[in-house]
């Protein structure tokens, strides 16, 4: 699987992983460059409460991962909240999912050795018009 | 922002831990779960009451090279009649992810972890109304 900047050998026939064009393992600066001012999603916005498709945030903690805490969204209702504050089942609350990269300690418990891991998180919910299947 | 050391006392540093120079860490960029796929409901970006578009950002010095960013199409939300209702707001939902940046330091190449804020989609919210005294 070849991506920008780093090429990952897939089999023994691939070029030597020590070749500068094919690093499988890299040494990375411990300081993470952070261009964002984002923190805990509960603090940064209250969209999860004000949304017409509100959600609850569940804390997912894993000390073997960086970041160790990830907040997972779960839609509160199947339907959406209408102008009267009631659940309208003609509409659907659906999760918005995103693949993110995290660091997994590898070997386990090692303080400064990691592997990239792709995980799927539900970030929030949105209100959609349902797909109606007409039965012939 | 430094990556915290393992905090739990029962996590003794195993003998098998690789030696790492000070101020850096060893990172294997062979991704765990590389082939997992998002199984979101079909084209929710168009069916949402707060619809959004996608823009692919491409950076040859970043891993992964492509990061998809969403942008809300409207300020308001789409009502049952398909019209924009500006009494409600379309707002972006964001999530941080890690990327690896390949950089040049003099004649050598180095790698830096970077946090990138990804706009994943949009949701429709009731606006916060500020009453002026």
């Amino acid at each position: 699987i070849v991506k920008a900047g780093i090429t990952i050998p897939r089999n023994p026939g691939c070029p030597n992983s020590e070749d500068k064009n094919f690093p499988r393992t890299v040494m990375v600066n411990l300081n993470i460059h952070n261009r964002n001012t984002n923190t805990n999603p509960k603090r940064s916005s209250d969209y999860y409460n004000r949304s017409t498709s509100p959600w609850n945030l569940h804390r997912n903690e894993d000390p073997e991962r960086y970041p160790s805490v990830i907040w997972e969204a779960k839609c509160r209702h199947l339907g959406c909240i209408n102008a009267d504050g009631n659940v309208d089942y003609h509409m659907n609350s659906v999760p918005i999912q995103q693949e993110i990269l995290v660091l997994r300690r590898e070997p386990p418990h090692c303080p400064n050795s990691f592997r990239l891991e792709k995980i799927l998180v539900s970030v929030g919910c949105t209100c959609v018009t349902p797909i109606v299947h007409h039965v012939a | 922002r430094k990556i915290p050391k393992v905090g739990h006392t029962f996590f003794q540093k195993p003998e098998s831990c690789p030696p790492v120079p000070g101020g850096s860490m060893k990172l294997d960029i062979g991704i765990i779960n590389e082939n997992q796929r998002v199984s979101m409901s079909r084209n929710i970006e168009s069916r949402s009451t707060s619809p959004w578009n996608y823009t692919v950002t491409w950076d040859p010095n970043r891993y992964p090279s492509e990061v998809v960013q969403a942008q809300c199409r409207n300020l308001g939300c789409i009502n049952a009649q398909g019209k924009e209702d500006i009494s409600m707001n379309s707002v972006p939902i964001q999530q941080e992810t890690l990327v690896v940046r390949r950089k040049h330091q003099g004649c050598s190449v180095s790698f830096q972890l970077e946090k990138v804020l990804v706009t994943v989609g949009c949701t429709c919210v009731t606006p916060v109304i500020h009453h002026v005294q």
Partner: antibody
Framework: EVQLVESGGGLVQPGRSLRLSCAAS????????MHWVRQAPGKGLEWVSG????????GYADSVKGRFTISRDNAKNSLYLQMNSLRAEDTALYYC??????????WGQGTTVTVSS | EIVLTQSPGTLSLSPGERATLSCRAS???????LAWYQQKPGQAPRLLIY???SRATGIPDRFSGSGSGTDFTLTISRLEPEDFAVYYC???????FGQGTKVEIK
């Protein structure tokens, strides 16, 4: 001295192909991503395509996707742009540019491509 | 599609004056970087500023970049005769260029 020299431009009929080359010198070519940027007569700059240091990743502008292919030969310190199904709107001065992670820091003098019947 | 809008289209100033060029992005993305280039007639573009505010090698300190989010500015503190040219902003990552601002002698 860091230098980029483009070649391969010329007059070509619509629908035909052309291959541009860029010879790099004065820097470690295989350490850097490279790009093609064009400028139509009297107009602004338009990014065309880019390629990572090891050819592992390539990017294209929507206007050329499926028609143009970027490639590089690190052993020859060369960058290429294969342009197929050329259109009149592809007429421009094509620049080769070196990537310095946050911007394009070295540019060639350009090669002119004219698409006309 | 991301659009970078530069203003004004043309700036008529005298040598020694201060020039302020604006670049507004239709969208702001984390992990995108803004750069400024100078182009003189018949010449290739030249990098002035990268990552919003960092001066490229060999660029005089009268050139400075600032801004964040969607609004960015290139400032030339005291115009020299050689500074009269067209200036482009560019968003690295989305690969969009602004339409350019021409700085001409008044």
């Amino acid at each position: 001295e860091v230098q980029l020299v483009e070649s391969g431009g010329g007059l070509v009929q619509p629908g035909r192909s052309l291959r541009l080359s860029c010879a790099a010198s004065g820097f470690t070519f295989d350490d850097y991503a490279m790009h093609w940027v064009r400028q139509a007569p009297g107009k602004g700059l338009e990014w065309v395509s880019g390629i990572s240091w090891n050819s592992g990743s390539r990017g294209y502008a929507d206007s050329v996707k499926g028609r143009f292919t970027i490639s590089r030969d690190n052993a020859k310190n060369s960058l290429y742009l294969q342009m197929n199904s050329l259109r009149a709107e592809d007429t421009a001065l094509y620049y080769c540019a070196k990537d310095m992670v946050y911007a394009l820091d070295v540019w060639g003098q350009g090669t002119t491509v004219t698409v006309s019947s | 599609e991301i659009v970078l809008t530069q203003s004004p289209g043309t700036l008529s100033l005298s040598p020694g004056e201060r020039a302020t060029l604006s670049c507004r992005a239709s969208q702001s993305f984390s992990g995108s970087y803004l750069a400024w280039y100078q182009q003189k007639p018949g010449q290739a573009p030249r990098l002035l500023i990268y990552d919003t505010s960092s001066r490229a090698t060999g660029i005089p300190d009268r050139f400075s970049g600032s801004g964040s989010g969607t609004d960015f500015t290139l400032t030339i503190s005291r115009l020299e005769p050689e500074d009269f040219a067209v200036y482009y902003c560019q968003q690295y990552g989305t690969w969009t260029f602004g339409q350019g601002t021409k700085v001409e002698i008044k």
